[in-house]
Interface confidence: low
Protein backbone atom coordinates (compact mmCIF):
# COMPACT_ATOMS: atom_id res chain seq x y z
CA UNK A 1 0.00 0.00 0.00
CA UNK A 2 1.57 3.28 -1.07
CA UNK A 3 1.63 6.39 1.05
CA UNK A 4 0.28 9.69 -0.21
CA UNK A 5 2.32 12.80 -0.85
CA UNK A 6 0.94 15.70 1.17
CA UNK A 7 2.09 19.29 1.25
CA UNK A 8 2.63 21.65 4.14
CA UNK A 9 2.72 25.31 3.28
CA UNK A 10 4.73 27.59 5.54
CA UNK A 11 5.13 31.34 5.27
CA UNK A 12 8.21 33.27 6.29
CA UNK A 13 9.48 36.83 6.35
CA UNK A 14 12.94 37.06 4.76
CA UNK A 15 14.98 40.24 4.99
CA UNK A 16 17.67 40.59 2.34
CA UNK A 17 20.30 43.25 1.80
CA UNK A 18 20.81 44.00 -1.85
CA UNK A 19 24.26 42.97 -3.07
CA UNK A 20 26.41 44.08 -6.02
CA UNK A 21 24.37 41.84 -8.32
CA UNK A 22 21.00 42.73 -6.82
CA UNK A 23 18.95 40.36 -4.68
CA UNK A 24 20.42 37.31 -6.38
CA UNK A 25 17.42 35.48 -7.74
CA UNK A 26 15.22 35.35 -10.82
CA UNK A 27 11.44 35.33 -10.87
CA UNK A 28 8.74 33.95 -13.12
CA UNK A 29 5.00 34.48 -13.12
CA UNK A 30 2.55 37.35 -13.40
CA UNK A 31 -0.89 37.80 -14.91
CA UNK A 32 0.58 37.68 -18.41
CA UNK A 33 2.99 34.80 -17.72
CA UNK A 34 1.38 32.22 -15.46
CA UNK A 35 3.95 29.84 -14.06
CA UNK A 36 1.42 27.60 -12.33
CA UNK A 37 -1.98 26.83 -13.83
CA UNK A 38 -4.66 29.25 -12.57
CA UNK A 39 -2.14 31.17 -10.49
CA UNK A 40 -0.67 34.49 -11.57
CA UNK A 41 1.64 34.64 -8.54
CA UNK A 42 5.35 35.42 -8.60
CA UNK A 43 7.73 32.49 -8.06
CA UNK A 44 11.47 32.12 -7.59
CA UNK A 45 12.86 30.40 -10.68
CA UNK A 46 16.57 30.52 -9.93
CA UNK A 47 18.85 31.37 -7.02
CA UNK A 48 22.12 32.90 -8.23
CA UNK A 49 25.25 31.40 -6.74
CA UNK A 50 26.89 33.65 -4.13
CA UNK A 51 24.12 36.23 -4.49
CA UNK A 52 22.30 37.85 -1.58
CA UNK A 53 19.53 35.24 -1.50
CA UNK A 54 21.95 32.30 -1.71
CA UNK A 55 24.13 33.67 1.07
CA UNK A 56 21.09 34.18 3.29
CA UNK A 57 20.06 30.61 2.49
CA UNK A 58 16.34 30.66 3.20
CA UNK A 59 14.81 31.42 -0.19
CA UNK A 60 14.33 28.33 -2.35
CA UNK A 61 13.66 27.81 -6.03
CA UNK A 62 9.94 27.25 -6.35
CA UNK A 63 9.02 29.53 -3.44
CA UNK A 64 6.13 31.90 -4.02
CA UNK A 65 6.78 35.55 -3.17
CA UNK A 66 3.67 37.06 -1.62
CA UNK A 67 4.87 40.59 -0.96
CA UNK A 68 7.86 42.90 -1.20
CA UNK A 69 8.30 45.51 1.54
CA UNK A 70 4.67 44.94 2.45
CA UNK A 71 3.39 45.43 -1.10
CA UNK A 72 1.21 42.59 -2.32
CA UNK A 73 2.32 40.90 -5.55
CA UNK A 74 -1.16 39.73 -6.56
CA UNK A 75 -2.41 40.53 -10.07
CA UNK A 76 0.78 42.10 -11.35
CA UNK A 77 2.15 41.87 -14.87
CA UNK A 78 5.52 40.12 -14.96
CA UNK A 79 7.41 43.29 -15.86
CA UNK A 80 5.64 45.23 -13.12
CA UNK A 81 6.87 42.66 -10.60
CA UNK A 82 10.42 42.87 -11.99
CA UNK A 83 10.32 46.67 -11.67
CA UNK A 84 9.02 46.42 -8.12
CA UNK A 85 11.98 44.26 -7.13
CA UNK A 86 14.44 46.54 -8.89
CA UNK A 87 13.08 49.58 -7.10
CA UNK A 88 12.66 47.97 -3.69
CA UNK A 89 15.71 49.64 -2.19
CA UNK A 90 18.76 48.38 -0.31
CA UNK A 91 17.01 46.50 2.49
CA UNK A 92 14.23 44.32 1.13
CA UNK A 93 11.63 42.43 3.12
CA UNK A 94 10.05 39.45 1.35
CA UNK A 95 7.03 37.49 2.52
CA UNK A 96 7.47 34.06 0.98
CA UNK A 97 5.57 30.81 0.90
CA UNK A 98 7.52 27.57 1.09
CA UNK A 99 5.92 24.29 0.21
CA UNK A 100 7.24 21.13 1.83
CA UNK A 101 6.55 17.73 0.38
CA UNK A 102 5.64 15.35 3.17
CA UNK A 103 5.91 11.61 3.00
CA UNK A 104 2.74 10.34 4.67
CA UNK A 105 1.78 6.82 5.61
CA UNK A 106 -1.31 5.14 4.18
CA UNK A 107 -3.54 6.38 7.01
CA UNK A 108 -2.73 10.04 6.51
CA UNK A 109 -4.87 12.88 7.81
CA UNK A 110 -4.75 16.00 5.69
CA UNK A 111 -4.36 19.09 7.81
CA UNK A 112 -2.78 22.50 7.90
CA UNK A 113 0.82 22.92 8.97
CA UNK A 114 1.45 25.63 11.55
CA UNK A 115 4.97 26.94 11.14
CA UNK A 116 4.76 29.30 14.08
CA UNK A 117 4.53 26.81 16.92
Amino acid sequence: MNGRVDYLVTEEEINLTRGPSGLGFNIVGGTDQQYVSNDSGIYVSRIKENGAAALDGRLQEGDKILSVNGQDLKNLLHQDAVDLFRNAGYAVSLRVQHRLQVQNGPIGHRGEGDPSG
Epitope: V5, G57, G62, L100
Partner: nanobody
Framework: HVQLVESGGGLVQPGGSLRLSCTAS????????MGWVRQAPGKGPEWVAT???????HYRNSVKGRFTISRDNAKNTLHLQMNSLKPEDTAVYYC???????????????RGQGTQVTVS
Protein backbone atom coordinates in the same frame (compact mmCIF):
# COMPACT_ATOMS: atom_id res chain seq x y z
CA HIS B 1 13.35 6.93 -7.70
CA VAL B 2 13.09 9.12 -4.59
CA GLN B 3 12.81 7.35 -1.27
CA LEU B 4 13.01 8.56 2.32
CA VAL B 5 13.29 6.06 5.17
CA GLU B 6 12.86 7.27 8.76
CA SER B 7 14.20 5.46 11.83
CA GLY B 8 15.16 6.01 15.45
CA GLY B 9 11.78 6.36 17.10
CA GLY B 10 10.76 4.58 20.26
CA LEU B 11 9.28 4.81 23.73
CA VAL B 12 11.00 7.24 26.08
CA GLN B 13 10.25 8.79 29.45
CA PRO B 14 9.58 12.53 29.79
CA GLY B 15 12.89 14.38 29.84
CA GLY B 16 14.57 11.69 27.76
CA SER B 17 16.24 11.89 24.36
CA LEU B 18 15.96 10.28 20.94
CA ARG B 19 17.83 10.75 17.67
CA LEU B 20 15.79 10.29 14.51
CA SER B 21 17.39 9.61 11.14
CA CYS B 22 16.10 9.84 7.59
CA THR B 23 18.10 8.19 4.85
CA ALA B 24 17.40 9.52 1.36
CA SER B 25 18.01 7.81 -1.94
CA UNK B 26 17.46 9.17 -5.42
CA UNK B 27 18.79 12.68 -4.86
CA UNK B 28 21.39 14.54 -2.75
CA UNK B 29 19.76 16.07 0.33
CA UNK B 30 22.34 18.86 0.41
CA UNK B 31 20.71 20.51 -2.60
CA UNK B 32 17.23 20.74 -1.08
CA UNK B 33 15.51 22.18 1.93
CA MET B 34 14.83 19.20 4.19
CA GLY B 35 12.74 18.97 7.29
CA TRP B 36 10.75 17.02 9.82
CA VAL B 37 7.00 16.97 10.23
CA ARG B 38 5.03 15.14 12.90
CA GLN B 39 1.50 13.86 13.15
CA ALA B 40 -0.17 13.04 16.46
CA PRO B 41 -3.11 10.60 16.54
CA GLY B 42 -6.24 12.18 15.11
CA LYS B 43 -4.49 15.43 14.26
CA GLY B 44 -3.14 16.97 11.10
CA PRO B 45 0.59 17.07 10.35
CA GLU B 46 2.59 19.90 11.88
CA TRP B 47 5.93 21.29 10.83
CA VAL B 48 8.78 20.70 13.30
CA ALA B 49 12.07 21.87 11.79
CA THR B 50 13.77 22.73 8.50
CA UNK B 51 17.37 22.85 7.36
CA UNK B 52 17.95 24.82 4.17
CA UNK B 53 20.58 24.05 1.57
CA UNK B 54 22.85 26.70 3.11
CA UNK B 55 22.68 25.02 6.50
CA UNK B 56 20.34 27.66 7.98
CA UNK B 57 17.93 25.98 10.42
CA HIS B 58 14.44 26.89 11.62
CA TYR B 59 12.30 25.35 14.37
CA ARG B 60 8.72 25.61 15.53
CA ASN B 61 8.59 27.58 18.77
CA SER B 62 7.57 24.64 20.95
CA VAL B 63 10.75 22.66 20.13
CA LYS B 64 13.33 25.47 20.03
CA GLY B 65 16.22 24.74 22.36
CA ARG B 66 15.24 21.08 22.67
CA PHE B 67 15.44 19.75 19.10
CA THR B 68 18.37 20.06 16.69
CA ILE B 69 18.11 19.31 12.97
CA SER B 70 21.27 18.39 11.08
CA ARG B 71 22.37 16.53 8.00
CA ASP B 72 25.23 14.27 7.01
CA ASN B 73 25.83 14.96 3.33
CA ALA B 74 28.32 12.10 2.98
CA LYS B 75 25.70 9.59 4.14
CA ASN B 76 22.81 11.51 2.56
CA THR B 77 21.05 11.37 5.91
CA LEU B 78 18.96 13.89 7.84
CA HIS B 79 18.88 13.81 11.65
CA LEU B 80 16.68 15.19 14.39
CA GLN B 81 18.19 15.16 17.88
CA MET B 82 15.34 15.40 20.36
CA ASN B 83 16.18 16.28 23.97
CA SER B 84 14.01 17.06 27.01
CA LEU B 85 11.13 15.22 25.41
CA LYS B 86 7.59 15.97 26.59
CA PRO B 87 4.37 13.92 26.33
CA GLU B 88 3.08 16.43 23.76
CA ASP B 89 5.96 15.43 21.46
CA THR B 90 4.30 12.03 21.00
CA ALA B 91 3.61 11.56 17.27
CA VAL B 92 4.71 9.82 14.12
CA TYR B 93 7.65 11.77 12.72
CA TYR B 94 8.03 12.06 8.94
CA CYS B 95 10.95 13.20 6.89
CA UNK B 96 10.04 15.99 4.44
CA UNK B 97 11.67 17.21 1.26
CA UNK B 98 11.44 20.72 -0.09
CA UNK B 99 9.94 21.03 -3.53
CA UNK B 100 12.57 22.32 -5.92
CA UNK B 101 11.60 23.83 -9.24
CA UNK B 102 7.95 23.88 -10.20
CA UNK B 103 5.96 24.86 -7.16
CA UNK B 104 3.12 22.39 -7.50
CA UNK B 105 4.99 19.48 -8.99
CA UNK B 106 4.05 16.27 -7.18
CA UNK B 107 6.59 13.51 -7.51
CA UNK B 108 5.33 9.95 -7.82
CA UNK B 109 3.69 8.77 -4.63
CA UNK B 110 5.88 6.57 -2.55
CA ARG B 111 5.87 4.55 0.61
CA GLY B 112 6.56 6.32 3.88
CA GLN B 113 5.63 5.02 7.28
CA GLY B 114 7.49 7.53 9.43
CA THR B 115 8.85 6.62 12.86
CA GLN B 116 6.77 6.55 16.03
CA VAL B 117 7.90 8.59 19.02
CA THR B 118 6.06 7.97 22.29
CA VAL B 119 6.85 10.00 25.40
CA SER B 120 5.21 8.44 28.44
Amino acid sequence: HVQLVESGGGLVQPGGSLRLSCTASGYPISTYAMGWVRQAPGKGPEWVATIYYSGVTHYRNSVKGRFTISRDNAKNTLHLQMNSLKPEDTAVYYCAKGVNGTYLRVEAEYRGQGTQVTVS
